[in-house]
């Protein structure tokens, strides 16, 4: 028995760790799933942040783990990405769905960021150069589409390289290799890590390495 309080909780189940798996919501004392109609990275970002796994990695249209059971609580979830909880996103109404089955249970993959790395290369020091990120064991780059000083500020702060002095595109620090991990990132400049900016998903891009982005931070400029 419970006495008042919010009657909603969120968890990820049957994943590799606490930051991945099938999305389940507890509403009115009952755990249920979320249908994948309209599933998006914005919804995943909200879930990851809510669960203290701030890095949204991907939004599988279905739970890669086993299908859930019980009620399907949410469908057509539409988030802006800045909501504090999944239930602040728009949806069809609690328990309302368009003939979803548990084969359509939504899943997410988040990360606490501990397995991610970032570095600047080919700039002459650790605080300037081409942006490279290590994800899933592979180093890759960031596309310059819509890259701006806010992105650079996040990177410089994250690398403890002071403030952002400038940013560049068009592979100003040479063309990288491997995956292009990010494209069209949206940062407000206050994020604690570049991967906490809004993005369309890891490895989703329409770029080539001629568009690799770079930055120069204040500590790097001092060393030049």
């Amino acid at each position: 028995s419970s006495l008042g309080g919010t009657d909603k909780e969120l968890r990820l189940v049957d994943g590799e760790n606490k930051c991945s798996g099938r999305v389940e919501v507890k509403v009115q004392e009952e755990w249920g799933t979320v249908c994948n109609n309209g599933w998006s990275m914005e919804a995943v970002s909200v879930i990851c942040n809510q669960l203290g796994c701030p890095t949204a990695i991907k939004a599988p249209g279905w739970a890669n783990s086993s299908a859930g059971s019980g009620r399907i609580w949410m469908d057509h979830v539409s988030c802006r990405g800045n909501e504090s909880a999944l239930w602040d996103c728009k949806h069809d109404g609690w328990g309302k769905h368009s003939n979803c089955t548990h084969q359509q249970d939504a899943g997410v993959t988040c990360s606490d960021g501990s397995n991610l790395e970032m570095r600047l290369t080919r700039g002459g020091n650790m605080c300037s150069g081409r942006i490279e990120i290590k994800f899933q064991g592979r180093w890759g780059t960031v596309c310059d589409d819509n890259f701006n000083i806010d992105h650079a500020s996040v990177i410089c702060r994250q690398l403890e390289c002071g403030s952002a002095v400038s940013f560049s595109g068009s592979s100003n620090f040479g063309e990288g290799s491997g995956p292009i991990w990010f494209d069209d990132l949206i940062c407000n400049g206050n994020e604690s890590a570049l991967w906490n900016c809004k993005h369309q998903g890891w490895g989703k891009h329409n770029c080539d390495h001629a568009e690799d982005a770079g930055v120069i931070c204040s500590k790097g400029a001092d060393l030049s």
């Epitope: 028995s1 419970s2 008042g4 309080g5 919010t6 009657d7 909603k8 509403v27 009115q28 004392e29 009952e30 009620r71 239930w87 602040d88 996103c89 728009k90 949806h91 069809d92 109404g93 609690w94 328990g95 309302k96």
Partner: antibody, heavy 116, light 107 residues
Framework: DVQLQESGPGLVKPSQSLSLTCTVT?????????WNWIRQFPGNKLEWMGY???????NYNPSLKSQISITRDTSKNQFFLQLNSVTTEDTATYYC?????????WGQGTTLTVSS | DIVMTQSPSSLSASVGDRVTITCRAS??????VAWFQQKPGKSPKPLIY???SLQSGVPSRFSGSGSGTDFTLTISSLQAEDFAVYFC?????????FGGGTKLEIK
């Protein structure tokens, strides 16, 4: 279709316990839904009191503290509201209400007067 | 508890009028607001759930809107059978709470 029918004593003395019954037809209370009690005071103010889910879990309005208990008898397809130590402030129309999450199905209500 | 403040408390209108009733929550309730209609001697009838979704069988002249803290119930063209008391309620968190009601009367 789900139909709910409240029944109760109509008149109760202060400090006594109140027991109301909701008889459900057309649907099993163990199949689905939350089974709520809501009351409406003179002057129209509505107050959600609590529910018992189809699986038997209860949740109560904290304002009623330890005064309230909601139970059920699955064999009779009924659920119950017990309110201890009633006062004249508990005079109201009591509704049993159900739905998956929303208050979709309402009984017609039973009026309770607390008076000596 | 979340307080739902409804306005106006009473309203006079004529058949054919467009009528708007508002409800304000003391904190954000996302879109988790429902609207009910109650006629004398009857139980409340659900009209709208999740701020803007019409309950089955409810005429399309009823509509709801809003999110966060401010919500509206609109009757586009008032019919004789619409004169009643209307309540909002929040479904966002426990305990569920209701507005004080708006009595819609014939002018």
């Amino acid at each position: 279709d789900v139909q709910l029918q409240e029944s109760g004593p109509g008149l109760v003395k202060p400090s006594q316990s109140l027991s109301l019954t909701c008889t459900v037809t057309g649907y099993s209370i163990t199949s689905d839904y939350a089974w709520n009690w809501i009351r409406q005071f003179p002057g129209n103010k509505l107050e959600w009191m609590g529910y018992i889910t189809y699986s038997g879990i209860t949740n109560y309005n904290p304002s009623l503290k330890s005064q309230i208990s909601i139970t059920r008898d699955t064999s009779k397809n009924q659920f119950f509201l017990q309110l201890n130590s009633v006062t004249t402030e508990d005079t109201a129309t009591y509704y049993c209400v159900s739905g998956t999450y929303y208050f979709d199905y309402w009984g017609q209500g039973t009026t309770l007067t607390v008076s000596s | 508890d979340i307080v739902m403040t409804q306005s106006p408390s009473s309203l006079s209108a004529s058949v054919g009028d467009r009528v708007t009733i508002t409800c304000r929550a003391s904190q954000s309730v996302s879109s988790d607001v429902a609207w009910f209609q109650q006629k004398p001697g009857k139980s409340p009838k659900p009209l709208i759930y999740y701020a803007s979704s019409l309950q089955s069988g409810v005429p399309s002249r009823f509509s709801g809107s809003g999110s966060g803290t401010d919500f509206t119930l609109t009757i586009s063209s008032l019919q004789a059978e619409d004169f009643a008391v209307y309540f909002c309620g929040q479904d966002y968190t426990s305990p569920r709470t209701f507005g004080g009601g708006t009595k819609l009367e014939i002018k």
